[in-house]
Interface confidence: low
Amino acid sequence: STTKCTVSHEVADCSHLKLTQVPDDLPTNITVLNLTHNQLRRLPAANFTRYSQLTSLDVGFNTISKLEPELCQKLPMLKVLNLQHNELSQLSDKTFAFCTNLTELHLMSNSIQKIKNNPFVKQKNLITLDLSHNGLSSTKLGTQVQLENLQELLLSNNKIQALKSEELDIFANSSLKKLELSSNQIKEFSPGCFHAIGRLFGLFLNNVQLGPSLTEKLCLELANTSIRNLSLSNSQLSTTSNTTFLGLKWTNLTMLDLSYNNLNVVGNDSFAWLPQLEYFFLEYNNIQHLFSHSLHGLFNVRYLNLKRSFTKQSISLASLPKIDDFSFQWLKCLEHLNMEDNDIPGIKSNMFTGLINLKYLSLSNSFTSLRTLTNETFVSLAHSPLHILNLTKNKISKIESDAFSWLGHLEVLDLGLNEIGQELTGQEWRGLENIFEIYLSYNKYLQLTRNSFALVPSLQRLMLRRVALKNVDSSPSPFQPLRNLTILDLSNNNIANINDDMLEGLEKLEILDLQHNNLARLWKHANPGGPIYFLKGLSHLHILNLESNGFDEIPVEVFKDLFELKIIDLGLNNLNTLPASVFNNQVSLKSLNLQKNLITSVEKKVFGPAFRNLTELDMRFNPFDCTCESIAWFVNWINETHTNIPELSSHYLCNTPPHYHGFPVRLFDTSSCKDSAPFE
């Protein structure tokens, strides 16, 4: 092909090529042609004769102002036609007359201000019609019943002001899953407008200034329709009462989106008419008081989003939003509750009572004063089968005994990014019989004891990053009971002292994070009592991170038991000489990071075993000694390996001898060196 199109598997991509005409030298068997972002003004039908197999044609982002009816005659198999972002202004009855197999027609962002006659009458198979971002002033798309298989009609960002039954009755035989009317200036819903449509399942009216009054009228018009999904985000719905959604009583509404409405007052029984609702979006509102009956009637809601729905109006404590006890008791089927980023004063004793199916609860950054978690804090969740609880970013400073004893089903507990500072006696976790992960990273300080985790033997993931960990060197180890642990993160704790039995018995451990500590002394031969082999017995360890620990020595047998090690990170240490055979047992190693150390020599006897099956190597920023003895084997290996070595040319530079300083290692000439073959 003389054009620069890329062709793969019957798909031709000719986008962004400044084309002024359709290429005439593409394979004739292509089924998908992308001509977007070019300078096409016309689509001569003749140019497509050779591409009769096309099922998808995308000519978006061009300057096409007219379409030849014969185009589809040449493309009898065309299913998807995308004309978005062009300059079409008129559609005649002939325009798409031959496009009888279309399932998708995209006309968004053109200049179509009016639809005359019946340009879509032949599109009996059309599923999606996108006319958004045009200048349409009405929903009138024809004068006779048509588009019986249409499922998605997208009319957002037009100038539609009223919905009229006589304009929508062309859809009398259609089942619309999605009628998208967002970002229009709709001020009127004429009687019967939605009943004109055969079946309407989804209606989207986001960014339409409805307000409470027009919303109520809308809902009355939706009565006795098939509506399932209704989206009214950013529709200036500042208050709701027990009549706002009355019309929806005669529907089976499943999803309601009222997000971004600055909703201030949610009156009692506002949603009593929605017993079928399953998904309810209320995020980004301004509710000042949730009454005990505000959510009454929502018996089938599975998912409720209340993120940033309760925010304080001023710095005054009196202006804090209120949630009455038992407000959620109606939500018997609720499984997922998001209450992130709110200004709720605290958790009352019956705040969550009645949520008998709740599985996921996010209370991240939800409270203004949740300093201490007591054995009463979560009593209202006692009958909830909660699996995941997120309590991050709440300035929690203390967890008292039995704080979670009500949550016997809990599997994931996230307490990260708080201000917890205390000794962990182990009683904090009592009752967490099914706990799988506890995330405690980024807290003030945690002092461990031998029983800190004695009551959670089921724990598989424990995250203790940057918690100023104390007593980690106590014996027996605080981690001894955690025989099922697979992930342990102890990074960023400035740990200097640990015993060789710290990880004893953790035979299932797969990931161990110890980066950013101060463990250098432990591996020094001069250490009193000799090096500390704290990695012994970890036969299933897959990932080991020891970055930034100040190591300048590695004992020869320190990795001896790590037969399944796949990734090891020893970057940002002070390693110079590594003992021969240190990596001998790492036959499964896939990734080795030694960047920013003081390594001068890369010899086969040290690195040969580690490099054998490596897919990724990072030894950037080491002061390599470019002599035959030090790097000849390495250079030959580099030039023959399939291992990925990022920035090999720029960040693997010789430091010595002086005449090689700054010279790329990979260009070092090994031809005069003896015995440097990388593979024998």
């Epitope: 089976n252 089938n300 199916n357 089968p385 599997e411 099914n434």
Partner: antibody, heavy 119, light 107 residues
Framework: QVQLVQSGAEVKKPGSSVKVSCKAS????????IHWVRQAPGQGLEWMGE????????NYNEKFKTRVTITADESTSTAYMELSSLRSEDTAVYYC????????????WGRGTLVTVSS | DIQMTQSPSSLSASVGDRVTITCRAS??????LAWFQQKPGKAPKSLIY???TLADGVPSRFSGSGSGTDFTLTISSLQPEDFATYYC?????????FGQGTKLEIK
């Protein structure tokens, strides 16, 4: 003890429809979702959809959405699965299953209904 | 949709053997994984739910593990009645797809 009793085997012609029933006893019918699973001869299990008998709310597997209709009659504690436009590859055992207090497993299963599609 | 990939598809073992079957999800299903046992001509039987909780009446030789995308069913010491086909199924979001099954046969 919860029991799910299914209707008997059926032989159907290609293009026709079949309606399989599943009657529950020994538990609260309306508060537990009923699921339908099928298994072609010698093949694995395939989840078709679920229904909340309390409100008729249904979640279908998209693969079957155009051809399957799941319904429930609370008064008789019976769930139904109707499959239309039958093809030979729809020959399978059709099971109904029910969740328990824990809604992340099926402790209760019907015995299955063999539907044979043959011309 | 989340796909479930089970391995191996068949397995020969002897009474007393330790057997491991794995199941991988194409997306994160948290802990919402169940294992079922099915014998010829019978409906499946629940063994394990929430990845590791034993269903009522299931012998302790059965155990489950894993989270996120990788899961394992282990039978610590095979008994004659354990020879059957085993399926994993996720319960995270519909469709609740099954693995393709692992047939456990007598060696």
């Amino acid at each position: 003890q919860v029991q799910l009793v299914q209707s008997g085997a059926e032989v159907k012609k290609p293009g026709s429809s079949v309606k399989v029933s599943c009657k529950a006893s020994g538990g609260t019918f309306s508060t537990y979702w009923i699921h339908w699973v099928r298994q072609a001869p010698g093949q694995g299990l395939e989840w078709m959809g679920e229904i909340n008998p309390n409100n008729g709310r249904i979640n279908y597997n998209e693969k079957f959405k155009t051809r399957v209709t799941i319904t429930a009659d609370e008064s008789t504690s019976t769930a139904y699965m109707e499959l239309s436009s039958l093809r030979s590859e729809d020959t399978a055992v059709y099971y109904c299953a029910r969740v328990g207090v824990m809604i992340t497993t099926f402790p209760y299963w019907g015995r299955g209904t063999l539907v044979t599609v043959s011309s | 949709d989340i796909q479930m990939t089970q391995s191996p598809s068949s397995l020969s073992a002897s009474v007393g053997d330790r057997v491991t079957i794995t199941c991988r999800a194409s997306g994160n299903i948290h802990n919402y994984l169940a294992w079922f046992q099915q014998k010829p001509g019978k409906a499946p039987k629940s063994l394990i739910y929430n990845a590791k909780t034993l269903a009522d009446g299931v012998p302790s030789r059965f155990s489950g593990s894993g989270s996120g995308t990788d899961f394992t069913l282990t039978i610590s010491s095979l008994q004659p009645e354990d020879f059957a086909t085993y399926y994993c199924q996720h319960f995270w979001s519909t469709p609740f797809t099954f693995g393709q099954g692992t047939k456990l046969e007598i060696k």
